[in-house]
């Protein structure tokens, strides 16, 4: 039985020429992780692998940074950046977990929550600051 | 360089409460994995506790779940161990030691610092 | 919980010779998905904190001498020296990190004749 959840930025709206981190947390699981995907829509942009460490996608490897930790950190950021991002963790004996982060990048100088880059940890003031809980797949 | 130093150990009674600290320097603190690990009096090595590059997750074995609490404070680079409702058994030289993200082996590990549970 | 025993608990070879030691998991500590083996080698000296030898079961840590080399699969390991210098008296634990909580082998002494 799968336990563990995913909590990810959640909904995040960024400047365009700006960057942003895009992160997940896996939780409630001693499942180990083995590798997490990042994808933009059908896209794959980085893998950071158990036994190789992160691989950024060649069409990516301008704007997209690995980290900090497991999560991805999106550069030069363009109108187009805008949509679904996931977070695949692949574990053990778990299977796969998915987390999802929408982005939407804007043209105007004022970025709803911008600075919001890392998972919410403390108190939070109102629903829309909660972490997205994931869901969980088997493999 | 790498370095863990650990401090906080001594005697305790059974039933007493001590803190670990371990500073780290020499690498990206936040950016790694960090566990205790306790080395018994027979030489025995166990692992105690665990805690994720942001604090996020923390993970115990049954001996200890309960009693000991592993947190972590990125800004100071610095990594804890509270333990409380300590028994003879607990009585060891516990180490820090670093652990690279989706690795679980420990790579670097500090001097140690020991604790003495008895009356 | 995995136990993993470690053999011979010690043993005393002569320098330049070739030492074999064993660690056995109680379950595989191979995953289907990558192919690894979840096995780390340590060496703690007297009055040393441990040190990381090998990962991956066969993987050498960098800065580790060629002479120490890790191999098995499943849960069968092996740590071998090819030729055992003076500085290499320690203790060797295998650890599986395969599935929480980890463990560790009681270790085995290696002295120098």
């Known amino acids: 039985m799968m336990t563990g959840t995913i909590e990810t930025t959640g909904n995040i709206s960024a400047e365009k020429g700006g960057s942003i981190i895009l992160q997940c947390h896996l939780s409630s699981t001693t499942a180990q992780v083995t590798q997490v995907n990042w994808e933009q829509q059908d896209q794959l942009l980085a893998i950071c692998n158990a036994d190789l460490g992160w691989h950024i996608s060649p069409s990516f490897k301008d704007r997209v940074a690995p980290g900090p930790g497991l999560g991805l950190t999106l550069q030069s950021l363009t109108v187009n950046d805008t949509g679904e991002y996931f977070c695949i963790y692949h574990t053990y004996p778990d299977g796969t977990y998915t987390g999802r982060i929408f982005l939407e990048v804007l043209e105007s100088s004022v970025a709803e929550h911008g600075a919001r880059f890392q998972i919410p940890t403390g108190d939070y003031k109102d629903d829309d600051d909660k972490p997205n809980k994931g869901s969980g797949t088997t493999s | 360089e790498v370095q863990l130093v650990e401090s906080g150990g001594g005697l305790v009674k059974p039933g007493g409460s001590l803190k670990l600290s371990c500073a780290a320097s020499?690498?990206?603190?936040?950016?790694?994995?960090m566990s205790w690990v306790r080395q018994t009096p027979e030489k025995r090595l166990e692992w105690v506790a665990y805690?994720?590059?942001?604090?996020?997750?923390?993970y115990y074995p049954d001996t200890v779940k309960g009693r000991f609490t592993i947190s972590r404070d990125n800004a100071k680079n610095t990594l804890y161990l509270q333990m409380s409702s300590l028994k003879s058994e607990d009585t060891a030289i516990y180490y820090c030691a670093r652990q690279i993200l989706l690795r679980y082996y420990f790579d670097y590990w500090g001097q140690g610092t020991t604790l003495t549970v008895s009356s | 919980d995995i136990v993993m025993s470690q053999s011979p608990s010690s043993l005393a070879v002569s320098v330049g010779e070739k030492v074999t030691m064993t660690c056995k998991s109680s379950?595989?500590?191979?995953?289907?998905?990558?192919?690894?083996?979840?096995l780390a080698w340590y060496q703690q000296k007297p009055g040393q904190s441990p040190k990381l030898l090998i990962y991956w079961a066969s993987t050498r840590e960098s800065g580790v001498p060629d002479r120490f080399t890790g191999s098995g699969s499943g849960t069968d390991f092996t740590l071998t020296i090819s030729s055992v210098k003076a500085e290499d008296l320690a203790v060797y634990y295998c650890q599986q990190y395969h599935s929480y909580p980890w463990t560790f082998g009681g270790g085995t002494k290696l002295e120098i004749k």
């Open positions: 805690i994720s590059d942001g604090g996020y997750n923390t």
């Open positions: 379950q595989s500590l191979l995953y289907s998905s990558n192919q690894k083996n979840y």
């Open positions: 020499g690498f990206a603190f936040s950016d790694y994995d």
